[in-house]
């Protein structure tokens, strides 16, 4: 069956995030630098579960802290700065995960290197994309 | 090193017709998802189009209709073809590629602009 244009719209979306989240990945694995070092002793709450778009908000709520450290970077690896990805990353998890539902986020008691931040969201993104083609 | 190459770009009437390419060492093609990005000046970064490993594609609502991604496994080159072009459609056009699985490594090129301009 052919898929929804609802659906198709969220995969997009879903595929944007995917593109910010691996940008930023990437960035920090290329950077050649020992601010690398100091990035990584920033902690990061995981969500204690993330299996619906509902839990973006997990991801929303880690926005700030996650700027925090890429402006520590100052670095070009980045491809747009680090404000503007982030605002670019709020701008999709809004509209993925909706305002209107209120959400309280669970975390996972145990934090996270930016690293670990990273690959966990990416990896939720991907899981979604894939149930949905 | 792993590159991506992005050409195709230029000026062009508004109603007029562009082909961008983006060629790719064939070690990020085959199995990746590959997608066309854009960035004007003072705009938020548009993903345009993409294109999963097994072909399916997916745009963005304000081209759809009117651009068209494909991708040549045997040439390692992916396509995005733009007809019906309009002012709003001037930018940067980017190329990704990305690994769907750990380490998540993503490429992507210089870029190539677009102008439609009468």
């Known amino acids: 069956a052919p898929t929804s244009s609802s659906t198709k719209k969220t995969q997009l979306q879903l595929e944007h995030l995917l593109l910010d989240l691996q940008m930023i990945l990437n960035g920090i694995n290329n950077y050649k630098n020992p601010k690398l070092t100091r990035m990584l002793t920033f902690k990061f709450y995981m969500p204690k579960k993330a299996t619906e778009l509902k839990h973006l908000q997990c991801l929303e709520e880690e926005l700030k802290p996650l700027e925090e450290v890429l402006n520590l970077a100052q670095s070009k690896n980045f491809h747009l700065r680090p404000r503007d990805l982030i605002s670019n990353i709020n701008v999709i998890v809004l509209e993925l995960k909706g305002s209107e539902t209120t959400f309280m986020c669970e975390y996972a008691d145990e934090t996270a290197t930016i690293v670990e931040f990273l690959n966990r969201w990416i990896t939720f993104c991907q899981s979604i994309i894939s149930t949905l083609t | 090193q792993v590159q991506l190459l992005e050409s195709g770009g230029g000026l062009v009437q508004p109603g007029g017709s562009l082909r961008l390419s983006c060629a790719t060492s064939?070690?990020?093609?085959?199995?990746?998802?590959m997608g066309w990005y854009r960035q004007a000046p003072g705009k938020q970064r548009e993903l345009v189009a993409v294109i999963s490993g097994g072909g399916d594609t997916n745009y963005a609502d304000s081209v759809k209709g009117r651009f068209t991604i494909s991708r040549d496994n045997s040439k390692d080159t992916m396509y995005l073809q733009m007809n019906s072009l309009r002012a709003e459609d001037t930018a940067v056009y980017y190329c990704y590629s990305r690994e769907v699985t750990p380490p998540w490594k993503l490429y992507w090129g210089q870029g190539t602009l677009v102008t439609v301009s009468s």
């Open positions: 064939g070690t990020i093609f085959s199995g990746y998802t």
